[in-house]
C-alpha cells in the first residue's frame, strides 16, 4: 500500500533570466527511492538513478543543474519555461509517486515564491 506523500514547492514564479530550484520531498513512507524523474508533459529534463547517478537531457544541458539533493535547478529562465513540471519518484516497494509544480516566469521583478502544498 502506498502511504507516502509528495511535498513540492507548489506554484512558484521567477524572473526571466533568473534561476529557480524545483524541489520535491517524499515523506511518510519507508520505501526506498530508486529513481527520480523530472519531466514536463512531453519532455524529460533529468533523471537521478540510485545506481547510475544523474542524466540531464541534452536539450537542457546548458541550463539545468542537478540538485540540491534530488531537486533540479533551472537557469537562464525564459517565458517559454512557464508551465508544469513533474517530479516522479520510483520507489520500492511502494511504486511511483508524482508531484506537480507550476512555474510562471515573469518579465517583471515582482516574482515571489508560492506557498508549499501537498499532493497525496
Amino acid at each position: 500500500m502506498m502511504t507516502g506523500t509528495i511535498e513540492t514547492t507548489g506554484n512558484i514564479s521567477a524572473e526571466k533570466g533568473g534561476s529557480i530550484i524545483l524541489q520535491c520531498h517524499l515523506s511518510s513512507t519507508t520505501a526506498q527511492v530508486t529513481q527520480v524523474n523530472w519531466e514536463q508533459q512531453d519532455q524529460l529534463l533529468a533523471i537521478c538513478n540510485a545506481d547510475l547517478g544523474w542524466h540531464i537531457s541534452p536539450s537542457f544541458k546548458d541550463r539545468v543543474a542537478p540538485g540540491p539533493g534530488l531537486g533540479l535547478t533551472l537557469q537562464s529562465l525564459t517565458v517559454n519555461d512557464t508551465g508544469e513540471y513533474f517530479c516522479i519518484y520510483h520507489t520500492y516497494p511502494d511504486g511511483t509517486y508524482t508531484g506537480r509544480i507550476f512555474l510562471e516566469v515573469l518579465e517583471s521583478s515582482v516574482a515571489e515564491h508560492g506557498a508549499r502544498f501537498q499532493i497525496p
Epitope: 529513481q35 508533459q41 519532455q43 533523471i47 547510475l52 516522479i88 520510483h90 508524482t98
Partner: antibody, heavy 118, light 107 residues
Framework: QVQLQQSDAELVKPGASVKISCKVS????????IHWMKQRPEQGLEWIGY????????KYNEKFKGKATLTADKSSSTAYMQLNSLTSEDSAVYFC???????????WGQGTSVTVSS | DIVMTQSHKFMSTSVGDRVSITCKAS??????VAWYQQKPGQSPKLLIY???YRYTGVPDRFTGSGSGTDFTFTISSVQAEDLAVYYC?????????FGGGTKLEIK
C-alpha cells in the same frame, strides 16, 4: 475503473475526412495527456501526437502535421482526432491512449479501424 | 527522431523457457523506455516503464533492464498466453517512437 472508449470503424472515400472519438472515464480527464497512435496491418506502431485536455495544448509528429488534428471536449471527457485528405495509406487502426508522466501509456482504447476505399 | 531497433522480428520459444528480447536506441535515452505486449486483435498493454519498473498487476516473470542505448525485456518462464508481439518505446522525447516489434511464437 479507467476506460478509453473509441468510436466505431469507418469506411471512407479517398479525399474525404474522418473524425474519431475517444471517450474517457474513471479518472479526471484534464490530468493526463491523450496520445494517438497508428497501426497498419502487420506493422508496428506510429505515434501521431497528443493533446493535453487541461489547456488544449497539442504536439504532433512532423509526419502527421496537416494530416491529423487533435481536439478535446472537457465537458464530455472526449478526445477527438480528425484525419483529412484521406488516401489508402491512411487505412489503419488508430488507438488513443492515456500517458502518465514517466510511466508510458498505461490505458489504451480498443482501436478504431479506418478503411479508405472508393 | 530517435530510432528504436528490435533486431528480431520473430522469436520461437517453448513453454517454460527463458526468452530475452533486445531493443537498441539510436541515441542515449537514459532509462526512458517502456515495453508493451500486443495480442492478436487487442490493444497494446503496458508491461514495463522506465526500463525496469513493472507496471501494476504485471506478473513478475516479466522484467526489463538496460540504460543508455541498450535495453532487454525478459520473460523468465514463458507461458502459452505470452504469445504476442512485444514493442519497446522510448518516452525520452517527442516524437515518441516504437521499435518494430518482436513476435513471440510458442513451439
Amino acid at each position: 475503473q479507467v476506460q478509453l472508449q473509441q468510436s466505431d470503424a469507418e469506411l471512407v472515400k479517398p479525399g474525404a475526412s474522418v473524425k474519431i472519438s475517444c471517450k474517457v472515464s474513471g479518472y479526471t480527464f484534464t490530468d493526463h495527456t491523450i496520445h494517438w497512435m497508428k497501426q497498419r496491418p502487420e506493422q508496428g506502431l506510429e505515434w501521431i501526437g497528443y493533446i493535453y485536455p487541461r489547456d488544449g495544448s497539442t504536439k504532433y509528429n512532423e509526419k502527421f502535421k496537416g494530416k491529423a488534428t487533435l481536439t478535446a471536449d472537457k465537458s464530455s471527457s472526449t478526445a477527438y482526432m480528425q484525419l483529412n485528405s484521406l488516401t489508402s495509406e491512411d487505412s489503419a487502426v488508430y488507438f488513443c491512449a492515456r500517458r502518465v508522466v514517466a510511466s508510458g501509456m498505461d490505458y489504451w482504447g480498443q482501436g478504431t479501424s479506418v478503411t479508405v476505399s472508393s | 527522431d530517435i530510432v528504436m531497433t528490435q533486431s528480431h522480428k520473430f522469436m520461437s520459444t517453448s513453454v517454460g523457457d527463458r526468452v530475452s528480447i533486445t531493443c537498441k536506441a539510436s541515441q542515449d535515452v537514459s532509462t526512458a523506455v517502456a515495453w508493451y505486449q500486443q495480442k492478436p486483435g487487442q490493444s497494446p498493454k503496458l508491461l514495463i516503464y522506465s526500463a525496469s519498473y513493472r507496471y501494476t498487476g504485471v506478473p513478475d516473470r516479466f522484467t526489463g533492464s538496460g540504460s543508455g542505448t541498450d535495453f532487454t525485456f525478459t520473460i523468465s518462464s514463458v507461458q502459452a498466453e505470452d504469445l504476442a508481439v512485444y514493442y519497446c518505446q522510448q518516452h525520452y522525447s517527442t516524437p515518441y517512437t516504437f521499435g518494430g516489434g518482436t513476435k513471440l511464437e510458442i513451439k
